[in-house]
């Protein structure tokens, strides 16, 4: 992507108070692959609702259904994971609500309640009734898919019976699971038929299989663990903003840039300019000028207002947002028409978004 020769510095600067940004973590909706997911846009009095995913406009297709304030995803896949937003457009303003969708082979956090009820899982058999292993409490095994935040404790259970009493061993991704395979090892509570891993990390992700066997047979059950990481991310800009605009000479125009950031964002409005009659510096990079940036003396940095425009104001306007993690930018074009031509809002063109990883 291009670098720029700056007429003014576009580095990190002191930021304005965070009054307008959704800085807290968005709500997370989790689904397993193949499941359907329905989310309601939690905004009131919405005349028109538009949806985006990772900053890109989301339209209906064979798997995505948009009905009123509801978004339905049919047959979810991991590629449906991401940051979603619904924007409610009203006559006077608009509001955006963000949420995360996580489609993984893991639908809920681990069963980490105390093993107070574990004793009934240990079934004693009449010594004469020889029996291959069997599950004694399948309810505790129904949840095969576990999505657990990093640093949490995970417990997998395989309550079983049999005669003679079966033994239990654990595999990770089909191979013997050894203590040295993870920092801090793990605990096996044979009395409760459980495997316990404390303070899970991303490398703990995978399939965990309990193998329960005696001389009369063997049974197994596999759980899938996904470790959900938490870390701050760079800004995300709402798709389609700023929008292309046109006005007549002497008219006024506004560009709007909607920002989502979980770390305080710094907003800059930048325009390509000429210096000494040239648009490019000696290094071949375009000259840019910072027109406005968030800071103490700057009101509502998400909006760039241009008054009494001239033909020289025509061109590309870039909304550049940074926090200490990273940057994002999107741009729009201003067309300045001669006085006799009536201005019209151009069809919005979405600039290429700055994708998250």
């Amino acid at each position: 992507r291009p670098s720029f020769s700056l007429v003014e510095d576009t580095t990190l600067e002191p930021e304005e108070p965070p009054t307008k940004y959704q800085i807290s973590q968005p709500e997370v909706y989790v689904a397993a692959p193949g499941e359907s997911l329905e989310v309601r846009c939690l905004l009131k009095d919405a005349a028109v609702i538009s949806w985006t995913k990772d900053g890109v406009h989301l339209g209906p297709n064979n798997r995505t259904v948009l009905i009123g304030e509801y978004l339905q995803i049919k047959g979810a896949t991991p590629r449906d994971s991401g940051l979603y937003a619904c924007t409610a457009s009203r006559t006077v303003d608009s509001e955006t609500w963000y949420f995360m969708v996580n489609v993984t082979d893991a639908i809920s956090s681990g069963d980490d309640e105390d093993d107070t009820d574990g004793a009934e899982d240990f079934v004693s058999e009449n010594s004469n009734n020889k029996r291959a292993p069997y599950w004694t409490n399948t309810e505790k095994m129904e949840k095969r898919l576990h999505a657990v935040p990093a640093a949490n404790t995970v417990k997998f259970r395989c309550p079983a019976g049999g005669n003679p009493m079966p033994t239990m061993r654990w595999l990770k991704n089909g191979k013997e699971f050894k203590q040295e395979h993870r920092i801090g090892g793990y605990k096996v509570r044979n009395q409760h038929w459980s495997l316990i891993m404390e303070s899970v990390v991303p490398s703990d992700k995978g399939n965990y299989t309990c193998v329960v066997e005696n001389e009369y047979g063997s049974i197994n059950h596999t759980y899938h663990l996904d470790v959900v990481e938490r870390s701050p991310h760079r800004p995300i800009l709402q798709a389609g903003l700023p929008a292309n605009a046109s006005t007549v000479v002497g008219g006024d125009v506004e560009f709007v840039c909607k920002v989502y950031s979980d770390a305080q964002p710094h907003i800059q409005w930048i325009k390509h300019v000429e210096k000494n009659g040239s648009k490019y510096g000696p290094d071949g990079l375009p000259y840019l000028k910072v027109l406005k940036h968030s800071g103490i003396n700057s009101s509502n940095a998400e909006v760039l207002a241009l008054f009494n425009v001239t033909e020289a104001d025509a061109g590309e306007y870039i909304c550049k947002v940074s926090n200490y993690i990273g940057q994002a930018n999107q741009s729009a074009w201003l067309t300045v028409l001669p006085k006799q031509q009536a201005p019209g809002r151009e069809k919005e063109i979405t600039a290429s978004p700055d994708y998250l990883e």
């Epitope: 990190l12 108070p17 800085i23 760079r234 770390a263 305080q264 940074s322 200490y324 993690i325 990883e357």
Partner: antibody, heavy 113, light 107 residues
Framework: QVQLVQSGAEVKKPGASVKVSCKAS????????IHWVRQAPGQGLEWMGA????????SYNQRFKVRATLTADTSTSTVYMELSSLRSEDTAVYYC??????WGQGTTVTVSS | DIQMTQSPSSLSASVGDRVTITCGAS??????LNWYQRKPGKAPKLLIY???NLADGVPSRFSGSGSGTDYTLTISSLQPEDFATYYC?????????FGGGTKLEIK
């Protein structure tokens, strides 16, 4: 997984320059600021500056603006921090960090005549 | 520049204790505060970001709170591996200043 590997320890004379490298892997290099932080013996942590590899944007602590230069080579996913006009008080451990979440192992720079 | 002031500068505690470290900013930093743990010879480790959010791989006994100019790091039940030096950091505006550190020692 995310890794930041820094170059080895350096011993320099006062007035000289030092260039410390930080090679990143395990993530999209251009998507995150790389910050530089140092800690002198018996002192606290001090932020020196940051660079955004995607476009080369830099931001410096005014204390280092004249003497420090941050550069990024996207072809090798490596960031460099050069500090010039070294003095004895620049003796410190220098760290690179991806957005303060992942840190390099540190590079000890000793300035001594 | 925003000044960050940590207290206490050192603290003695026992395994199992509840420990609180405070950090004050010279001006409102609007929750833009990180907490780090640093052990001798090791790089700092991010514990809390945005004043209250637990970072990856950090045990839930660590928690952060506060707003405006006053922030707190709490360790609910000290573990042997928690003895280290803790730093707060302003991430609102450059320069991203750190507090002077709190050295947590075994009593």
């Amino acid at each position: 997984q995310v890794q930041l590997v820094q170059s080895g320890a350096e011993v320099k004379k006062p007035g000289a320059s030092v260039k410390v490298s930080c090679k990143a892997s395990g993530y999209i290099f251009t998507n995150y600021y790389i910050h530089w932080v140092r800690q002198a013996p018996g002192q606290g942590l001090e932020w020196m500056g940051a660079i955004y590899p995607d476009n080369g944007d830099t931001s410096y602590n005014q204390r280092f603006k004249v003497r420090a230069t941050l550069t990024a080579d996207t072809s090798t996913s490596t960031v460099y921090m050069e500090l010039s006009s070294l003095r004895s008080e620049d003796t410190a451990v220098y760290y690179c960090a991806r957005a303060f979440t992942y840190w390099g192992q540190g590079t000890t720079v000793t300035v001594s005549s | 520049d925003i000044q960050m002031t940590q207290s206490p500068s050192s603290l003695s505690a026992s395994v199992g204790d509840r420990v609180t470290i405070t950090c004050g900013a010279s001006e409102n930093i609007y929750g833009a505060l990180n907490w780090y743990q640093r052990k001798p010879g090791k790089a700092p480790k991010l514990l809390i970001y945005g004043a209250t959010n637990l970072a990856d791989g950090v045990p839930s006994r660590f928690s952060g709170s506060g707003s405006g100019t006053d922030y707190t790091l709490t360790i609910s039940s000290l573990q042997p591996e928690d003895f280290a030096t803790y730093y707060c950091q302003n991430v609102l505006s450059t320069p991203y200043t750190f507090g002077g550190g709190t050295k947590l020692e075994i009593k």
